[in-house]
Interface confidence: medium
Amino acid sequence: KRFHDVLGNERPSAYMREHNQLNGWSSDENDWNEKLYPVWKRGDMRWKNSWKGGRVQAVLTSDSPALVGSNITFAVNLIFPRCQKEDANGNIVYEKNCRNEAGLSADPYVYNWTAWSEDSDGENGTGQSHHNVFPDGKPFPHHPGWRRWNFIYVFHTLGQYFQKLGRCSVRVSVNTANVTLGPQLMEVTVYRRHGRAYVPIAQVKDVYVVTDQIPVFVTMFQKNDRNSSDETFLKDLPIMFDVLIHDPSHFLNYSTINYKWSFGDNTGLFVSTNHTVNHTYVLNGTFSLNLTVKAAAPGPCPPPPPPPRPSKPTPSLATTLKSYDSNTPGPAGDNPLELSRIPDENCQINRYGHFQATITIVEGILEVNIIQMTDVLMPVPWPESSLIDFVVTCQGSIPTEVCTIISDPTCEITQNTVCSPVDVDEMCLLTVRRTFNGSGTYCVNLTLGDDTSLALTSTLISVPDRDPASPLRMANEFDYKDDDDKLEHHHHHH
């Protein structure tokens, strides 16, 4: 059998195989050693007994999508049946005090591969034997501790395969410079040691995507916005847009990235090299936000000029490139800075990413302030309580609810939360009455809200000990002290 007979039904064309050569991978036309690595079709009864105690599940993930030319990393994690895990020596053991259907196991081992390898025969002086080989016959690499690696992973994509010896979790990175754009399939077959041969335990496949577009995501944040995920924001308050470029292999690390913004409100185009930008919409309505991200990335060099005779061009990735330039220095003195310009790469190409969103701008509560706090007269039966009126103003739209959260002086441990609907006039002036049980310093968070916005102000308030001899007190106003955006209110007792 050949690798492609074993590993997958999908056969890429000769053109695809030729133009998608992966560095360090081998052609799936190679022969597969079926004696050492038996091949079982889906539904074969032997799968049931391929692992003691149940089936092993392999989970394949990747950091796709990958910008063409960057590295894409695939990770395979094996999930063992309940109560089983891999120990430090690579053996599979039962977890202590863990019950599965078979109850508690007397034998600590599911698979004791250390013991198997110690009494294994037929080895030469290097620890190499006829069975310590991959399916294509290549010997296992002898890293330190390789004997503790008891799983063989065979990755297969684009008519090529890659073999890896590993533990219950492995990672493989592939450079995508020669990979055709679009979705591709990665298949992985996993074998375990079984004496001097191997047994298949899991198969898994996943789609990955190679793209010539920079994968771009934009997060949007605005103070007082009640729901940041609904793409509805408030007029007259800055929105912070933060661009996240999906570049897990840091392919664009040496690139200068330009961000070109159009906010859709006739403010024109804004270009920045910073991934964050603030923009304030001054009108209500629906606006189309457009972002173009541009980066000069390492790319393929242009093909050499064709010979003068007419010939049919061969399609290649270069035909999709928007622009490319060689950075090979010219004669001395031609360009004094050329050598220092782009490290490690001779050719560059402009790559683009796009983001579009429709955002809705509405009125909202822009600001809330406590302008006065008044100690309210309390009747005798509640000597331990203080009643305080907060006079609050706001700007922007009219709130429909008010909440006060009373907490400890650090503003971290909530003691009491009260929310109530409010009916406020156009001037947005309201009085909020709250009870404080006992003396001490309290943190008061006061929020005003409507359907789309939530505005907050915080203050520290100091409530003194009550004088039981004073059944009635006159209302007193508090003194104000500005303290780093928090108002410190001293409650004087007369």
Epitope: T256, D325, P336, S340, N350
Partner: antibody
Framework: QVQLVQSGAEVKKPGASVKVSCKAS????????MGWVKQRPGQGLEWIGA????????NYNQNFKGRVTMTVDTSISTAYMELSRLRSDDSAVYFC???????????????WGQGTLVTVSS | EIVLTQSPSSLSASVGDRVTITCSAS?????MHWYQQKSGTAPKLLIY???NLASGVPSRFSGSGSGTDFTFTISSLQPEDAATYYC?????????FGGGTKLEIK
């Protein structure tokens, strides 16, 4: 060797437009941004904007927005800067400068044109 | 925009003197460039990326600094160094230049 050669001096009336050219030679024209800088008599340097000749991606200083247009003709390795609705304070020398390789901020303007004097007078 | 404040705005020094010009940025930047401009000519790049000497520029010119504070130094002033010197940043749009330092030889 690298050279940037600009068009000759211009005299314009207020409200008119002027288009200054900058012909590049001695390097791959599309590999570097082309910047434009204004210098009024006896004054300092003011950045007008820049264009990437590989895709005509432009970036203008807000102070000139709506009045400046930068273009390129890659077939003749030439960059253009057009300034419209001219005012008397637009009287200045305008320089083109070859700027960062692929927009890299690590590099300044390593080559400059000789400058084009634009006089705006009624 | 990032404002570059150059000081001094003018200075007079003798041949052989060590001359230092500073450039302060209103926000932190990664790279500063320095130019020399003589009357009636285009600016000439002397230092790029804060401390790299442009090709053909004498080694008496140097640059240093990081963040918001950058320095340009002429270790031993020569008669041909009489000119106006500008700092320049292209870390953030719009690119900006310092106001210039006019250097005269006594």
């Amino acid at each position: 060797q690298v050279q940037l050669v600009q068009s000759g001096a211009e005299v314009k009336k207020p409200g008119a437009s002027v288009k200054v050219s900058c012909k590049a030679s001695g390097y791959t024209f599309t590999a570097n941004w082309m910047g434009w800088v204004k210098q009024r008599p006896g004054q300092g340097l003011e950045w007008i904007g820049a264009i990437d000749p590989s895709d005509s991606f432009t970036n203008y200083n807000q102070n000139f927005k709506g009045r400046v247009t930068m273009t390129v003709d890659t077939s003749i390795s030439t960059a253009y800067m057009e300034l419209s609705r001219l005012r008397s304070d637009d009287s200045a020398v305008y320089f083109c400068t070859r700027s960062g390789y692929y927009g890299s901020p690590k590099l300044g303007g390593d080559y400059w044109g000789q400058g084009t004097l634009v006089t705006v007078s009624s | 925009e990032i404002v570059l404040t150059q000081s001094p705005s003018s200075l007079s020094a003798s041949v052989g003197d060590r001359v230092t010009i500073t450039c302060s940025a209103s926000s932190s930047i990664s790279y500063m460039h320095w130019y020399q401009q003589k009357s009636g000519t285009a600016p000439k790049l002397l230092i790029y990326s804060t401390s790299n000497l442009a090709s053909g520029v004498p080694s008496r010119f140097s640059g240093s600094g990081s963040g918001t504070d950058f320095t340009f130094t002429i270790s031993s002033l020569q008669p041909e160094d009489a000119a106006t010197y500008y700092c320049h940043q292209w870390n953030s749009y719009p690119c900006t230049f310092g106001g210039g330092t006019k250097l005269e030889i006594k």
